[in-house]
């Protein structure tokens, strides 16, 4: 087909020859093209697209990607001829870094229903070239690294020694999405979640007297989990002192919030106080009551069948622990005023008598 | 660009102390856990353990009453102290980064960057 | 503690052949394993996590597939600097385990 009428882009890749990396060219067809292949989703420009252009739409067909041989030589189908270059949709990932990657790069649909759409294709200029010797030793990784629930930041590798104050305008991709929240050479993150990995690609202008070329960077960036430097934190009960009906069954609950532990062995106890007396309760198991990929909450209770008055003169600690250190938090029993009867009292001393403590057995989960 | 070099004495006499240091440059020893590999002659890999950045540690319960990890985060480098060696310890000790990778609600483990390994004899 | 067993113990194959290593845990491990490539004198390189995940930068003609207890190392076509030993390792269970290897080596 005749590639004339092809938009055209030039793209710079230059390498890091310490490390290996990836890069990728998009399909970026263009507009305003009217055919059904080039539509964009008519935007304004404070709306991001879902994806790059024309990769969105379900019924559209992926593209074909060809190389321009420099010798003028008829176009040849990549999948064929390249197996370190893979085609992904509408993406061209390039495995290896080198020289002979340099070359031009033709897409367009697989389907070609109009005969406007023969001109609906882009055609990328590759320069690839390694990085001069002169560039920064401290330059960013093309693999970086975000650790779950921590803050955190992904630099472009290409721009990464300058300051924030010297660096050009830089355009970010997720995943083959517009990023637009960002236009610096780095991206903060506030918070890291699971969703913060994937494939980045950042891309800034850089213009000489004869032309203007995309200098274009990709990142690998992971989520990656490591120990909690905190002893677990008890959210419940937060309270010291808790109001009770003498003779009524109780339960009091114990919460803790323990961060990430590879090993994970959390230890979670209650036990009673009373007078020089100190001795740990048997008391159903614990149960993870809720699990992330960063820390998990577990919980134990506490049951007596019945408050007694002994209860209001102990008391109830419960002990969490983890490899870092433990935390207590102490309960006070305490009457409330104006309830429960002679009734309820005398048969709440009946049962100081026999100290039964019942108890229900749950599951514990862990990481 | 993480690059890890293991250095340590190459020979070590039985019931002695085998002491060997990994150092970390071109990245930071903090967030990852840091992994001791060990392979004797013509044998396959065998775990010694691992340390956090910030302290704690696990180790193979077959060696574990003998192995000692610790990490200096100020020199970027982590070490490996294995007490009364016998001509069972001779081997080539790798470090390595041990990565967990967060993915779809679990976690996987993996050493992503090793060092070249530091041949240590144990013979009198 | 889990036992890796790779089989076979060595192969030999010629460039352009697929090749299939397996490594069988003596328990599920659900997806905890990854595969490395070691050359002699070398120290091992990682190619897969998660049983099926390839690191970035190695070569797509690696695959990794399994989980549970049955798990497999694929090289679709081999090239020539393939011929290695290849270890699993999992980390479902503590102490981490290594298979005993698989020598792949020229025909």
């Known amino acids: 087909f005749n590639i004339s009428g092809c938009s055209t882009k030039k793209l710079l890749w230059a390498y890091s020859t310490r490390s290996e990396e990836e890069f990728i060219l998009f399909c970026d067809l263009p507009e305003p093209q009217k055919s059904h292949f080039c539509h964009r989703s008519q935007l304004s420009p404070t709306q991001v697209p879902d994806h790059l252009p024309f990769t969105d739409s379900k019924d559209l067909p992926d593209v074909q990607w060809y190389r321009q041989p420099s010798n003028g030589d008829p176009l040849e189908d990549i999948r064929k001829s390249y197996p370190h270059i893979i085609q992904d949709k509408c993406t061209l990932r390039f495995l290896t870094p080198g020289v002979n990657n340099t070359g031009s790069y033709i897409c367009r649909p697989k389907m070609i229903k109009s005969p406007y759409d023969v001109a609906c294709c882009v055609k990328m200029i590759l320069e690839v070239k390694p990085q001069s010797n002169a560039s920064c030793e401290n330059s960013a990784s093309h693999k970086q690294d975000l650790l779950l629930g921590s803050t955190g930041s992904i630099s472009c590798p290409s721009l990464s020694c300058q300051s924030d104050a010297q660096s050009p305008e830089v355009t970010w991709y997720k995943n083959g999405k517009l990023l637009s929240m960002t236009r610096s050479n780095r991206i903060v993150v506030d918070e890291v979640y699971i969703y913060h990995q994937g494939t980045y690609v950042c891309d800034y202008t850089q213009s000489d007297t004869a032309s203007s070329w995309t200098v274009r960077a990709v990142v690998q960036v992971r989520t990656i989990v490591g120990d909690t430097k905190l002893k677990p934190d008890i959210l419940d009960p937060v309270e010291s002192t808790l109001e009770v009906e003498l003779g009524k069954p109780l339960t009091i609950s114990c919460k803790a919030r323990f961060g990430f532990e590879r090993v994970f062995n959390p230890v979670m106890k209650w036990y009673i106080k009373d007078a020089d007396l100190e001795w740990e309760v048997s008391v159903p198991e614990a149960k993870s009551i809720k699990s992330t990929l960063k820390d998990e909450i577990i919980e134990r209770n506490i049951i007596l069948e019945k408050v007694t008055q002994r209860d209001l003169r102990r008391t109830f600690v419960c002990f969490v622990q983890n490899s870092i250190g433990n935390t207590t938090q102490s309960v006070q029993l305490k009457e409330k005023r104006g309830s429960g009867g002679l009734n309820d009292i005398f048969e709440a001393q009946k049962i100081e008598w026999h100290e039964t403590v019942r108890f229900q057995s749950h599951h514990h989960h862990h990481h | 660009q993480v690059q890890l070099q293991e250095s340590g004495p190459g020979l070590v006499k039985p019931s002695e102390t085998l002491s060997l240091t990994c150092t970390v440059s071109g990245g930071s020893i903090n967030n990852y856990y840091w992994s001791w590999i060990r392979q004797p002659p013509g044998k396959g890999l065998e775990w010694i353990g691992y340390i956090f950045y910030s302290g704690t540690t696990n180790y193979n319960p077959s060696l574990k009453s003998r192995v000692t990890i610790s990490v200096d985060t100020s020199k970027n480098q982590f070490s490996l102290k294995l007490s009364s060696v016998t001509a069972a310890d001779t081997a080539v000790y790798y470090c390595?980064?041990?990565?967990?990778?967060?993915?779809?609600?679990?976690?996987?483990?993996?050493?992503?960057?090793w060092g070249q390994g530091t041949t240590v004899t144990v013979s009198s | 503690a889990i036992q890796l067993t790779q089989s076979p113990s060595s192969l030999s194959a010629s460039v352009g052949d697929r090749v299939t290593i397996t490594c069988r845990a003596s328990?599920?491990?659900?997806?905890?394993l990854a595969w490395y490539q070691q050359k002699p004198g070398k120290a091992p390189k990682f190619l897969i996590y998660?049983?099926?995940s390839l690191e970035s930068g190695v070569p797509s003609r690696f695959s990794g597939s399994g989980s549970g207890t049955d798990f497999t190392l694929t090289i679709s076509s081999l090239q020539p600097e393939d011929f290695a030993t290849y270890y699993c390792q999992q980390f479902n269970s503590y102490p981490i385990t290594f298979g005993q290897g698989t020598r792949l080596e020229i025909k």
């Open positions: 998660e049983a099926s």
């Open positions: 390595a980064r041990d990565v967990g990778i967060a993915a779809r609600n679990s976690y996987y483990y993996v050493m992503d960057v």
């Open positions: 328990q599920g491990i659900s997806s905890a």
